[in-house]
């Protein structure tokens, strides 16, 4: 129960008749109209966010103190989000600034800055972020401040802006009395407040029934001010593990729900994959099969390990192999996938197998992968390879049971050529190169790829079906280039590595040197 | 760079139908308020039709109601308007046009929008 | 709905001139109101919003006041470049209703 409230000042109430004072003059603030359900509101806006150094200034008009000693200031606002505008608006602030001055006369518009004094920084609880300003929902912002005792005849507010982009739609000054109060679940019994203005009344509250106070709190105490309002509350109650706070009252959380701490949260309904709990309950237990990690919140379902990768192929590239996958068809009810690859290579020839970890190349960290791709680089032809993908999550670690999938692939790519340069001239380079007998078989021709060192604009290619070529007309002292590669009835083998060879320099004496 | 790229205009006998596009490119598409203006040869503008960022709320002008309906699909960053029972006064150049509130430097948002962005235009003449 | 009036239809005008558009509502409309540029065959540009904010990249010699009912569109000194015509438009209601132009043209 609030006290009587005595208005001093109300901005919304007066449909902006009130003729408050701006500095500068019209450069920040701006009194604008505009409808709200259905009805013309006025307010007091700013929004110079994109320019700094900002320093608006609103002052109320003089208001009447009367018998008040102590005043509250009622504030209702909202503010723009910074990151609404292009590029976050770099100056743009979320705050603005209360001040007053008392006075023992109206000043009219002579306003100085150095009269007023800071009562507080006013900052949003809720910012409105782009959705809400196109869907017109008007974040609202409450905030109170209080000022005393007050000794003159009047006083101001004023309003600083140093750069939001905010709009004041209510503005109340009011004091008031001391009434009965249940506050934080504890009661307090009506105080006659005190008639000097340093005469605050300590007053003890009670908790309600199923209520205490929080470990390491303070019992609850309230101050009765001269003004009539309870001020300065210290500790308050809880309701307990078990109950939760419905209206004044504690009450036992209702079948399937529970609350597992001394809290002001309510009651929470039984997550998905719990049993369902008594009256009163203050935790809701997994059911079998179901686990909740060390960091899972009480309120989180239970969930479970996912069942392996859905899909799984391999697709060999050459010496390459690009694996994909499909989510597990059950999560387990987690979002914390991540995905295990592992490899296995055997001999066709003797069946041997053996883990190839330290042998191949992995397009990114086998281990804790969340994509669902990885390429495998770095196999050896003629060889068999197994790859096993395990899907885990953060309960995964609960059970013994594993969730994978394998493919198994071949690899059949010819061996890169090793290449030699066997002579060179001025004007020519001679290359022969080898690859093991067993794929010389399968080899339908070679081809060699040329080209001079740093023109990446143009290549010469020449084909042959011996193991070597004189690659002829070439620039002297000139550093060429040079790879070879084999060609298969399957496609292109696997190239050699490119080498450096230089032709000789005019002034060279041989014709031919190794 | 923001563009809205209109399309579907031509010629078409009273009462007809027609279907106009504006293909939107160079901003998120999904964020923005999306309109309809129209501009009868040697006329003044009219605003024609208004669409939400999501696809609601819609309004229109009292001279289309009933006759015009604007959509959109945000998957194809395309807006559209679909009018049907066309008359002679429908002749214009129908411009697209655009409103994001991140540009609109006010603490609450105005009663309607404004226009930030227009697309070239694209011609329906309605003529027997 | 709300009619925008504007004033003059045309005027004439030199490069240098400080040229002065007024637009007129039937009634107040706060400061919801827009500028816009429109050159012959070409789509409308924004100038200004909220009767005197600035749109982004739009040169500073044009400015706007007013409220309520009396609008005001000014280019302080007149370029080569704002030879079009100007329109107001209302968005204090869903009608979002423009004004008939004013083409500016030189003298």
């Known amino acids: 129960a609030q006290g009587k409230e005595v208005v001093l000042l109300d901005f919304a109430a007066a449909g902006g008749e009130l003729g408050w004072l701006t500095h500068p003059y019209g450069k920040g603030w701006d009194l604008m109209q505009n409808i709200m359900n259905d009805m013309p509101i006025y307010m007091y806006s700013v929004c110079n966010v994109m320019s700094g150094d900002q320093d608006n200034w609103l002052r109320t008009n003089w208001v009447y103190r009367g018998e008040a000693e102590r005043i509250f200031i009622e504030l209702k606002f909202t503010v723009r989000d910074c990151n609404s505008f292009p590029g976050g608006a770099s100056s743009c602030k979320e705050t603005f600034n209360l001040y007053y001055a008392e006075s023992d006369l109206d000043y009219g518009t002579n306003f100085q800055k150095r009269l007023f004094t800071k009562i507080d920084t006013i900052a949003p609880d809720e910012i409105t972020v782009s959705s809400d300003f196109e869907a017109r929902h008007v974040k609202l912002n409450v905030e109170e401040r209080s000022v005393g005792p007050l000794t003159r005849k009047g006083f101001y507010l004023a309003f600083q802006d140093i750069g939001a982009c905010v709009a004041l739609l209510s503005v109340r000054v009011y004091y008031k009395k001391c009434p009965e109060l249940l506050q934080s679940l504890a009661r307090f019994p009506e105080t006659i407040a005190g008639s000097d203005a340093p005469s605050l009344a300590t007053v003890a509250g009670t908790c309600v029934d199923h209520a205490v106070v929080p470990p390491g709190g303070e019992e609850p105490r309230m101050h009765c001010a001269v003004d009539g309002e309870w001020l300065v509350p210290i500790g308050q109650c809880l309701c307990q593990a078990g109950y939760e706070k419905v209206e004044d009252a504690c009450q036992a959380c209702s079948p399937g729900f529970f609350k597992f701490e001394v809290s002001e949260s309510p009651c929470l309904e039984c997550p998905e994959h719990t049993l369902p709990s008594p009256e009163g309950a203050t935790s809701c237990e997994c059911e079998e099969g179901f686990f909740r990690a060390p960091q899972d919140p009480m309120s989180m379902p239970c969930t479970r390990p996912p069942s392996a990768p859905h899909y799984l192929t391999a697709v060999g590239m050459g010496a390459k192999v690009e694996l994909r996958w499909t989510p597990p068809q059950d999560s387990g009810g987690r979002e914390d996938i991540v995905y295990s690859v592992t490899c296995e290579q055997c001999w066709p020839e003797s069946g041997e197998c053996g883990p190839c970890e330290s042998s191949v190349r992995y397009s990114e960290p086998p281990h804790g992968l969340t994509r669902t791709s990885v390429t495998v680089s770095d196999l050896e032809p003629h060889m068999n390879y197994t790859f096993t993908v395990e899907a885990r999550n953060g309960v995964s670690g609960l059970v013994t049971s594993r969730s994978f999938r394998t493919a198994s692939v071949s690899i059949n790519q010819t061996e890169p050529p090793k290449v030699r340069l066997e002579g060179r001239s001025t004007t020519s380079l001679s290359v022969s190169w080898s690859i093991p007998p067993p794929q010389q078989s399968r080899v339908w021709k070679y081809e060699v790829t040329y080209r001079k060192k740093g023109d990446s604009n143009s290549y010469n290619v020449r084909r042959t079906e011996g193991f070597s070529v004189t690659l002829d007309d070439l620039a002297p002292d000139t550093t060429y280039l040079v790879q070879v590669q084999a060609l298969t009835q399957e496609g292109q083998g696997a190239g050699s590595k490119v080498h450096e060879f230089q032709t000789l320099s005019p002034e060279g004496s041989g014709s031919l040197a190794v | 760079e923001v563009q809205l790229l209109e399309s579907g205009g031509g010629l078409v006998q009273p009462g007809g139908s027609l279907r106009l596009s504006c293909a939107a490119s160079?901003?998120?598409?999904?964020?923005?308020?999306m309109a309809w203006v129209r501009q009868a040869p040697g006329k003044g503008l009219e605003w024609v039709s208004r669409i939400g960022p999501s696809g609601g709320p819609t309004h229109y002008a009292d001279s289309v109601k009933g006759r015009f309906t604007i959509s959109r699909d945000n998957s194809k960053n395309t807006l559209y308007l679909q009018m049907n029972s066309l008359r002679a006064e429908d002749t214009a150049v129908y411009y697209c046009?655009?409103?994001?509130?991140?540009?609109?430097?006010?603490?609450?948002?105005?009663?309607?929008?404004?226009?930030?962005?227009w697309g070239q235009g694209t011609l329906v003449t309605v003529s027997s | 709905d709300i009619q925008m009036t504007q004033s003059p239809s045309s005027l004439s005008a030199s490069v240098g001139d400080r040229v002065t558009i007024t637009c007129r509502a039937s009634q107040s409309i706060s400061t919801w109101l827009a500028w816009y540029q429109q050159k012959p065959g070409k789509a409308p540009k924004l100038l200004i919003y909220?009767?005197?904010n600035l749109h982004t990249g739009v040169p500073s010699r044009f400015s706007g006041s007013g409220s309520g009912t009396e609008f005001s569109l000014t280019i302080s000194s007149l370029q080569p470049d704002d030879f079009a015509t100007y329109y107001c438009q209302q968005y204090n209601s869903y009608s979002r209703t423009f004004g008939q132009g004013t083409k500016v043209e030189i003298k």
């Open positions: 046009a655009g409103y994001d509130s991140g540009y609109d430097y006010v603490a609450v948002a105005g009663p309607a929008e404004y226009f930030q962005h």
């Open positions: 909220k009767a005197s």
């Open positions: 160079g901003f998120t598409f999904s964020h923005y308020m």
